[in-house]
Interface confidence: medium
């Protein structure tokens, strides 16, 4: 069965200054590849977390995303402000060469 990306929470309500937990799970280990979190969709979407590279000081992962049999891609975003409001997407990429290819979005 083809991998599905599941974001079970349709909305998350968080008080200013608190931590938001954005849940995301995959239904399969295949294909191998990293995940990224975005706010918004389309060409103008904002990268919130990239498993492979970058520095995201407000973001922590719920589990070890680099473990190959991990299917929990949930993240926590600390010190929430009103500016963080929006729709967040968990996106699974398929490992590729030279670049990873977007595979499926929550």
């Amino acid at each position: 069965e083809e991998l599905q990306v599941i974001q079970p929470d349709k909305s998350v309500l968080v008080a200013a200054g608190e931590t938001a937990t954005l849940r995301c799970t995959a239904t399969s280990l295949i294909p191998v590849g990293p995940i990224q979190w975005f706010r918004g969709a389309g060409p103008g979407r904002e990268l919130i977390y990239n498993q492979k590279e970058g520095h995201f000081p407000r973001v922590t992962t719920v589990s070890d995303l680099t473990k190959r049999n991990n299917m929990d891609f949930s993240i926590r975003i600390g010190n929430i402000t009103p500016a963080d409001a929006g729709t967040y997407y968990c996106v699974k990429f398929r490992k590729g060469s030279p670049d990873d290819v977007e595979f499926k979005s929550g």
Partner: antibody
Amino acid sequence: QVQLVESGGGVVQPGRSLRLSCAASGFTFSSYGMHWVRQAPGKGLEWVAVISYDGSNKYYADSVKGRFTISRDNSKNTLYLQMNSLRAEDTAVYYCAKEPRSYWHGYGMDVWGQGTTVTVSS
Amino acid sequence: DIQMTQSPSSLSASVGDRVTITCQASQDISNYLNWYQQKPGKAPKLLIYDASNLETGVPSRFSGSGSGTDFTFTISSLQPEDIATYYCQQVDVLPYTFGGGTKVEIK
């Protein structure tokens, strides 16, 4: 070619510290998870620790937890193992090894260093 | 921790013999099992990953099978250069534990 070279081993008294290094070459070090594995004289292999490609995740065997720290400097292509409060049972050859797949761990170790010997003795 | 029980601990066989080593995990590890060869005084070498996949450059006389808790490693025709100790390792759950090893000697 892909190469891992350990250094820093030696003879040390119980309770003292030692830092092992593993210099990597021939591959994009910053993209791979790395392990330390040890082998006591005449014994089998014991997994010690793993660190993710970016250093954000680290895991340890219970036998070294709280005493050993795995770290990496991707700008220097070097893996480290800081060993504190050493015990006689830490005496072993220490190997560094790389994961086969970039950005992931849990696939094993496809390239190993030659090992460096640590002897803990009074 | 997952315990890996490897047997036998040592064996002696003739050149050309079929050699079989077994490894049993204390819980289901799917196919997340590797086999390594270690020659005296040398670092281990990965032979088989994910229970049955031959690492690049490894001779085809080496093979592996199994899933869940029971795994088998086979050398179809033992060669003098195969004298070594062989280890299984589970890479499903941290810590990534090894079996105790099987020392293979020539009769």
